[in-house]
């Protein structure tokens, strides 16, 4: 077995895409290696190449399908191995059995959008992008917005428990420039994380109204 | 904590497969990771299989060749070995061990990672 300074992870994105990361100090960085998935009751197979993402890392996709087909289930269960070359033969560095819905990483939301827009609040919009229609409506939200003079990792984070694919946000200041991002999680899974931030949303809240005189 | 019985050793003709299980009692059996170590006569106590607590994933000896598959039931309180396949460089004593840590899955883990062990179960493979 290889030495505890290797690491194997592993996401499925619930859909199609199993996306991995294999670190291990010490391995030449331009080793050729590369992840096979076999899973245990499906006729396909299917290989990506590591390819560096720092000094002693490597990452890679395996493209299981179509974006939006589902590729595996609840029950199935992926046999995972990093094969490296060695001379002319390839040698087996790591094996793991993998299942899917309990390494749920989603893609990041997208086509996030106004809906409407005042002086203290803003209503926005977003939607989920390649998630199995399995979770129904099983899914939490996480938000945050950016607002001037703070960074994103100043910015509170706002948990919305249940499928919701919008949010209003209040007390907002007046003729002020924010940005907005959102991520999502399924509910189910042992190791299932957030997905990506979204892209930032930019938006300006409408200035107040000028007072009249009375 | 946890005690550990394997049972399901013996002997056994080579190509065939063997199913090895690890009974749990005394504790919370899905709060722990577990492992299946083997040691052959004369040789060091050898990494096997280690499988989450909840059994998202199960890491595999390379020597292992894909032969063999661990399972656990948090249900019954039991790990389980697979092993198809046999060779005779299989024989040894199969041993069921407990981590209290947290296990990720992601890594090969030492058997000093491993807290509590069972008594072990001997299997033979005969050419």
């Known amino acids: 077995a290889v030495n505890g300074t290797s690491q194997f992870t592993c996401f499925y994105n619930s859909r199609a895409n199993i996306s991995c990361v294999w670190s291990q100090d010490g391995a030449l960085q331009d080793t050729s290696c590369q992840v096979h998935a076999w899973p245990d009751r499906r006729r396909w197979n299917q290989t990506c190449e590591l390819l560096p993402v720092s000094q002693a890392s490597w990452a890679c996709n395996l493209i299981l399908g179509a974006p939006d087909s589902q590729k595996l289930t609840t029950v199935d269960i992926v046999t995972l191995r990093v094969l490296c070359r060695e001379g002319v033969r390839w040698r087996v560095m790591a094996i793991q059995d993998f299942k899917p819905f309990e390494n749920l990483r989603l893609m990041a939301p997208i086509s996030l959008q106004v809906v409407h827009v005042e002086t203290h609040r803003c209503n926005i919009s977003w939607e989920i992008s390649q998630a199995s229609h399995y979770f129904e409506r099983h899914l939490e939200f996480e938000a945050r917005t950016l607002s001037p003079g703070h960074t994103w990792e100043e910015a509170p984070l706002l948990t919305l428990k249940q499928k919701q694919e919008w949010i209003c946000l209040e007390t907002l200041t007046p003729d002020t420039q924010y940005e907005f991002q959102v991520r999502v999680k399924p509910l189910q899974g042992e190791f299932t994380t957030w997905s990506p931030w979204s892209q930032p949303l930019a938006f300006r809240t409408k200035p107040a109204a000028l007072g009249k005189d009375t | 904590q946890v005690q550990l019985v394997e049972s399901g050793g013996g002997l056994v003709q080579a190509g065939g497969p063997l199913r090895l299980s690890c009974a749990a009692s005394?504790?919370?059996?899905?709060?722990?990771?577990m492992g299946w170590f083997r040691q052959a006569p004369g040789k060091e106590r050898e990494f096997v299989a280690a499988?989450?607590?909840?059994?998202?994933?199960?890491m595999y000896a390379v020597s292992t060749e894909g032969r063999f598959t661990c399972s656990r039931d948090n249900a019954k309180n039991t790990v389980y070995l697979l092993m198809n396949s046999l060779k005779p460089e299989d024989t040894a004593v199969y041993y069921c061990?407990?981590?209290?840590?947290?296990?990720?899955?992601?890594?090969?883990?030492?058997?000093?990672?491993?807290?509590?062990w069972g008594q072990g179960t001997q299997v033979t493979v005969s050419s």
């Open positions: 061990a407990a981590m209290t840590s947290y296990y990720s899955g992601t890594y090969y883990p030492d058997s000093s990672d491993f807290d509590i």
């Open positions: 005394g504790g919370t059996f899905s709060s722990y990771a």
């Open positions: 499988t989450t607590r909840g059994g998202g994933r199960t």
